[in-house]
């Protein structure tokens, strides 16, 4: 639909059009499998508009049905990682506060490649943590165009 | 200027230990990984171990996993790597080297080294 | 894992000339992952090339990388005295990352 000449002088956040793009800042200390990510112009191709971080996980300002989207590449990658030297590597997506809501949203396996990529739509409210975990010992590359997360508000 | 200075090095029995260490400076040390290259008498570049900014996620050579342990204190901008039944074959100058930020393990740069040998 | 050879083993070169020196792996280097570093006697390796073809920070321009696949070439476009040294190969795109065991150039 069309936006009156008002609604397109609104700040996008005020339309519910709520919108992240992250990179990678770091991975967790010993048993945090976490992925911790950062966003903003003065980091290259990422940004905030409405979701917000909180010590490195995204956090949900309003409510409704938003894609989710994640690429992570490993920069340390072998054709055996997912088979006799290691555990497998995967990486899941979800919901980790509040712990009322917690559930995953994606699961992801790198079977002997170095890239996975995934994206769904999904409700998500306003307060809902969303939280990346990486398995295993394995170490994504933080290169912007090999790792990123982020999310689009959809519809209400 | 980052600076890389590895200590630790010695002679030792084959199935001794020996602790190594490296201090670094002249950059963020917490947000770069780290590994340890080694590079035998006459002989080529081998990589040995890395270990994440954060300290949580290490990686073995085939050669040294079950023996060797890296671990870093990202308090006292120290690196280290625990060698445990050391063989001949470990004999080698050992280097700490900084990861690209990145994380791939190629190597911006590297500490002087220090010398492990293993004899009886 | 990825195995690299280089060659020639040995370069004889003057000052001021070109000196051609080639990486070839086993197998494919993902990404043109391939970086190569300098290395002196009683001294570490310097970083000169990575993704094959980027230069480090601080490098001069004569030094140059190319290369994809399997077959990578470092180039020198006119040798300065310090440049005679040893010059290593190393793959990063699939682990254990590897190295070559270097082409030594030369003073003639």
């Known amino acids: 639909q069309r936006l009156s000449r008002a609604q397109q002088q609104l700040p996008l956040e005020s339309l519910g059009w709520d919108i992240a793009e992250l990179q990678l800042n770091h991975t967790g200390p010993q048993q945090d499998p976490r992925l911790y990510w950062q966003g903003g112009p003065a980091l290259g191709r990422s940004f905030l508009r409405g979701p917000e971080l909180d010590k490195g996980q995204l956090r949900i300002r309003r409510d409704g049905i938003y894609m989710v989207h994640i690429q992570v590449t490993l920069a340390i990658c072998s054709s055996t990682s997912t088979s006799r030297h290691h555990h497998p590597t995967t990486l899941a997506v979800g919901i980790c506060s509040p712990a009322s809501r917690s559930i995953s949203l994606l699961r992801l396996s790198f079977h002997q490649g170095c890239t996975i990529a995934s994206q769904r739509l999904t409700p998500l409210a306003r307060g809902d943590t969303l939280c990346t975990n990486l398995t295993g010992t394995l170490l994504p590359s933080r290169n912007t165009d090999e790792t990123f997360f982020g999310v689009q508000w959809v519809r209400p | 200027e980052v600076q890389l200075l590895e200590s630790g090095g010695g002679l030792v029995q084959p199935g001794g230990s020996l602790r190594l260490s490296c201090a670094a400076s002249g950059f963020t040390f917490s947000t770069y990984a780290m590994s340890w290259v080694r590079q035998a008498p006459g002989k080529c570049l081998e990589w040995v171990s890395l270990i994440s900014g954060s300290g949580g996620r290490t990686y073995y050579a085939e050669s040294v996993k079950g023996r060797f342990t890296i671990s870093r204190d990202n308090s006292k901008n120290t690196l280290y790597l625990q060698m445990n039944s050391l063989r001949a074959e470990d004999t080698a100058v050992y280097y700490c080297a900084k990861h690209d930020y990145s994380n791939y393990p190629y190597f911006d740069y590297w500490g002087q080294g220090t010398l492990v040998t293993v004899s009886s | 894992e990825i195995v690299l050879t280089q060659s020639p083993g040995t370069l004889s070169l003057s000052p001021g000339e070109r000196a051609t020196l080639s990486c070839r792996a086993s197998q494919s280097v993902r990404s043109n992952y391939l970086a190569w570093y300098q290395q002196k006697p009683g001294q570490a390796p310097r970083l000169l090339i990575y993704?094959?073809?980027n230069r480090a920070t601080g490098i001069p321009d004569r030094f140059s990388g190319s290369g994809s696949g399997t077959d990578f070439t470092l180039t020198i476009s006119r040798l300065e005295p310090e440049d005679f040294a040893v010059y290593s190969c190393q793959q990063y795109g699939i682990s254990p990352p590897t190295f070559g065991c270097g082409t030594k150039v030369e003073i003639k």
């Open positions: 993704g094959a073809s």
